[in-house]
């Protein structure tokens, strides 16, 4: 049963204008980089690819979601170190035997070109020039995003 | 190399007076619910443990993190069905064996009184009334959450 | 309380070892990367290594590769250092530290009050 | 290794004066850099980084600028308690290397 204070709480928010804004992030916090309508955080320390997302998480971020090759390429051209592999939120799902963005989306096979294989337990990385396929164990660094722009009555409905 | 308008971005960026207020939620979005100084989100679909972390990531938003006893009644509060479980943010670490929050501190055991086992695969879920060990495998419900409150200066020192 | 409380320094004979502990508390010492970071008698701040937040990764200054080995244990909070053929040029004060952000090495925003090895004949 | 080149490596001033401290970086470093002031016998504080964020609980005296090679640290009106060593340490890249530090010192 819920008690008073809560119910009321909780019938206050759910009666609230709808439509009111929400004011979103108006400029990139401290460490991280604006890109287009994003604010990216290029970590420096190494995680797997689960403690990546769980780290881009607590941060009330999401690993990279690439939209298509010209996001991509203008993300790659941040990268200062051509030797440096970064995480991004996508994954090979082994019961659907497809790449997955960690939003529920596939992989459109066109957007990214993927180097190694797509099996089990592999996680895709980015460098400056290409985009791998790596054993989600392996420590490597990661990138996290959040949206900049403000968006109006920005829904989430349910995954 | 980054391009020149990529760099100009950056440095701009960068150069931004950093004391900026960042203005975080002034309200719950549309579906999300008001608890305190969080907005809680309880999916109506249901997905395993992973997916859930990686939804709520992608919604910007972290799997629910209970710091106490307090938390976990009030939040319970607002479950409306004794029959439905939802996952929370926090699962078995194998090589630490122990329950671990998403945001890498250990459970204090005085917290949760978990039913069930804790073991390799274990994930907790809550439900109105209790807290549960499952594998994590399992299809139920989920709670995202996102802070409510906005943040001088937030440059997530402990997340 | 958030601290860094380090321990196990002392008075070694050149070539000979010790471990110093870090104990850590008051923050989720688990998603953060660690360092250790000294100070001889007088001089500047020198960084000897790092560790990745899960442990896997490790760091060190060319003055001590090979001879030391960082390590954790997270289920303790705890940082080690392992000194092995210790050197005059070893003596320090040894600090631990914390960086500001989960997603950085370094901005440590906290210290331990620090550990003082001798190597001394 | 990044060398960091701090100058001076010490200055006499007064309370109450503007002292300036500067870090040179040996390669560009874009924001990666903090500053720490030291007391005898203590551990290192935080007092800014990436570059001009001040620390939380940092006196607003302190400030930092910089970007790419050239860094400095401006104490605007100095106080008693700001009588200590000052180091720059950059976070770019591993291995982490700290200036060789600057004594501010009473006049």
């Known amino acids: 049963q819920k008690s008073s204070i809560e119910k009321c709480s909780v019938d206050i928010q759910q009666s609230r204008n709808k439509t009111t804004e929400r004011p979103g992030l108006l400029n990139c916090p401290i460490y991280w980089q604006q890109l287009r309508e994003k604010c990216l955080l290029f970590s420096h320390t190494v995680n797997p690819w689960n403690n990546s997302l769980a780290d881009c998480s607590t941060k009330e971020s999401s690993l990279l979601l690439i939209r298509d090759k010209d996001e991509l390429i203008h993300t790659q051209n941040l990268i200062r170190d051509k030797a440096i592999l970064f995480w991004i939120g996508l994954n090979f799902s082994l019961s659907e035997k497809n790449w997955k963005w960690i939003n529920g989306s596939f992989l459109n096979s066109n957007d990214l070109e993927i180097r190694g294989d797509a099996k089990e337990n592999s996680c895709i990385s980015i460098s400056q020039t290409s985009v791998y396929s790596e054993y989600c164990s392996t420590e490597i660094r990661w990138i996290c995003q959040k949206e900049l722009t403000p968006v109006r009555n920005k829904v989430y409905p349910d995954s | 190399q980054k391009s020149s308008i990529e760099k100009c971005s950056v440095d701009i960026q960068q150069s931004r007076n950093k004391t900026t207020e960042r203005p975080g939620l002034l309200n719950c979005p549309i579906y999300w619910q008001q608890l305190r100084e969080k907005c809680l989100l309880f999916s109506h679909t249901v997905n395993p443990w992973n997916n859930s972390l990686a939804d709520c990531s992608t919604k910007e938003s972290s799997l629910l993190l209970i710091r106490d006893k307090d938390e976990l009644i009030h939040t319970q509060n607002l479950i409306r069905d004794k029959a439905i479980l939802f996952w929370i943010g926090l699962n078995f670490s194998l090589s630490e064996k122990n329950w671990k929050w998403i945001n890498g501190s250990f459970l204090n055991s005085n917290d949760l009184e978990i039913r069930g086992d804790a073991k390799e695969n274990s994930c907790i879920s809550i439900s109105q009334t209790s807290v549960y060990s499952e594998y994590c495998s399992t299809e139920i419900r989920w709670i995202c959450q996102k802070e409510l409150t906005p943040v001088r200066n937030k440059v997530y020192p402990d997340s | 309380e958030v601290q860094l409380l380090e321990s196990g320094g002392g008075l070694v004979q050149p070539g000979g070892s010790l471990r110093l502990s870090c104990a850590a508390s008051g923050f989720t010492f688990s998603q953060y990367a660690m360092s250790w970071v000294r100070q001889a008698p007088g001089k500047g701040l020198e960084w000897v290594s790092a560790i990745s937040a899960v442990g896997g990764s490790t760091y060190y200054a060319d003055s001590v590769k090979g001879r030391f080995t960082i390590s954790r244990d997270n289920s303790k909070n705890t940082l080690y250092l392992q000194m092995n053929s210790l050197r005059a040029e070893d003596t320090a004060v040894y600090y631990c530290?914390?960086?500001?952000?989960?997603?950085?090495?370094?901005?440590?925003?906290?210290w331990g009050r620090g550990t003082l090895v001798t190597v001394s004949s | 290794d990044i060398q960091l080149t701090q100058s001076p490596s010490s200055v006499s001033a007064s309370v109450g004066d503007r002292v300036t401290i500067t870090c040179r970086a040996s390669?560009?470093?874009?924001?990666?850099l903090a500053w720490y002031q030291q007391k005898p016998g203590k551990a290192p504080k935080l007092l800014i980084y990436a570059a001009s964020a001040l620390q939380s609980g940092v006196p607003s005296r302190f400030s930092g600028s910089g970007s790419g090679t050239d860094f400095t640290l401006t104490i605007s009106s100095l106080q008693p308690e700001d009588f200590a060593t000052y180091y720059c340490?950059?976070?770019?890249?591993?291995?982490?290397?700290f200036g060789g530090g600057t004594k501010v010192e009473i006049k």
């Open positions: 530290a914390k960086p500001l952000d989960s997603s950085q090495w370094a901005d440590f925003d906290l």
């Open positions: 390669q560009d470093i874009s924001s990666w």
């Open positions: 340490q950059q976070a770019d890249v591993l291995p982490i290397t």
